[in-house]
Amino acid sequence: LTCLGGFASPGPVPPSTALRELIEELVNITQNQKAPLCNGSMVWSINLTAGMYCAALESLINVSGCSAIEKTQRMLSGFCPHKVSAGQFSSLHVRDTKIEVAQFVKDLLLHLKKLFREGQFN
């Protein structure tokens, strides 16, 4: 994870920082996971494409009473602070497959790391 962005380097904050912070939080969740994350709650899987942050937020927000992912929910809101207007991202509510929150987080983490490596910070 320390390869993700020059933590020691001073100077301007790179555009990668918001993505890096989100990746760090997801890493923390996966590493600190002892009991099943969020009691094994299930969430809708999403298309990891355009509108991914909003889609991830919409999926994870359905998990209640799970403090482990609240910071993630709020950080995702940073990318997607206002509600997506109807039809803007039709993929947001395609609900066909449910997976455990732990798997959702792992899938999201892998995809975000890939985006980071490719330099797709937004």
Partner: antibody, heavy 118, light 111 residues
Framework: EVKLVESGGGLVQPGGSLRLSCAAS????????MSWVRQAPGKGLEWVAS???????YYPDSVKGRFTISRDNAKNSLYLQMNSLRAEDTAVYYC????????????WGQGTLVTVSS | DIQLTQSPSSLSASVGDRVTITCKAS??????????MHWYQQKPGKAPKLLIY???NLESGVPSRFSGSGSRTDFTLTISSLQPEDFATYYC?????????FGGGTKVEIK
């Protein structure tokens, strides 16, 4: 501890311009959306502008085209450029950390007063 | 725009009283079963403070005497046992539709 400190308020004539600043500390600034909310003297609250961590901006029609929200993540700072000011823009302007539509305005600064008068 | 009407606009109460404030929206503020309604407390000369998010979720650090309920267009903020520090103005706010709007406020005064 989350801290938001506004500055830049003051007296300006109608049609004039003003730039407000907000210095943020105590959280990873770049990871969160930010907003400006105002309150006219003795009145209620009104949302003015929001900016996402990625730089997308949102405005109500009342200020669209006149106000511009921006952020400098290197300086942990939020700004509001206000042009073509009107008497009805007179208010205390609050900087707020916006935790999104599912969580609301989680933290607020103490505000800076903008008075538009001739 | 979604209009939020709070009632009463002001009320007088004593320490220990149970206080209920209502907020009525001109249209539903629910989004896929989640109510995008939040409550804030503001003391004179101070900044607002988030109390409740999504209609019924207590923000971290807020005393448990505060609670929220409701859905679609009708919402309630309840203070189970009013404390001296609770005398303030309370605002509801919706984030379901731009522009985000606030209620007119309810001032809770000492009887």
């Amino acid at each position: 501890e989350v801290k938001l400190v506004e500055s830049g308020g003051g007296l300006v004539q109608p049609g004039g311009s003003l730039r407000l600043s907000c210095a943020a500390s105590g959280f990873t600034f770049i990871s969160y959306a930010m907003s400006w909310v105002r309150q006219a003297p003795g009145k209620g609250l009104e949302w003015v502008a929001s900016i996402s961590s990625g730089g997308n901006t949102y405005y109500p029609d009342s200020v669209k085209g006149r106000f511009t929200i921006s952020r400098d993540n290197a300086k942990n700072s939020l700004y509001l450029q206000m042009n073509s000011l009107r008497a009805e823009d007179t208010a205390v302007y609050y900087c707020a950390r916006l935790d999104g539509y599912y969580f609301g305005f989680a933290y607020w600064g103490q505000g800076t007063l903008v008075t538009v008068s001739s | 725009d979604i209009q939020l009407t709070q009632s009463p606009s002001s009320l007088s109460a004593s320490v220990g009283d149970r206080v209920t404030i209502t907020c009525k929206a001109s249209e539903s503020v629910d989004n896929y079963g989640k109510s995008l309604m939040h409550w804030y407390q503001q003391k004179p000369g101070k900044a607002p403070k988030l109390l409740i998010y999504r209609a019924s979720n207590l923000e971290s650090g807020v005393p448990s005497r505060f609670s929220g309920s409701g859905s679609r267009t009708d919402f309630t903020l309840t203070i189970s046992s009013l404390q001296p520090e609770d005398f303030a103005t309370y605002y509801c706010q919706q984030s379901n539709e731009d522009p985000w709007t606030f209620g007119g406020g309810t001032k809770v005064e000492i009887k």
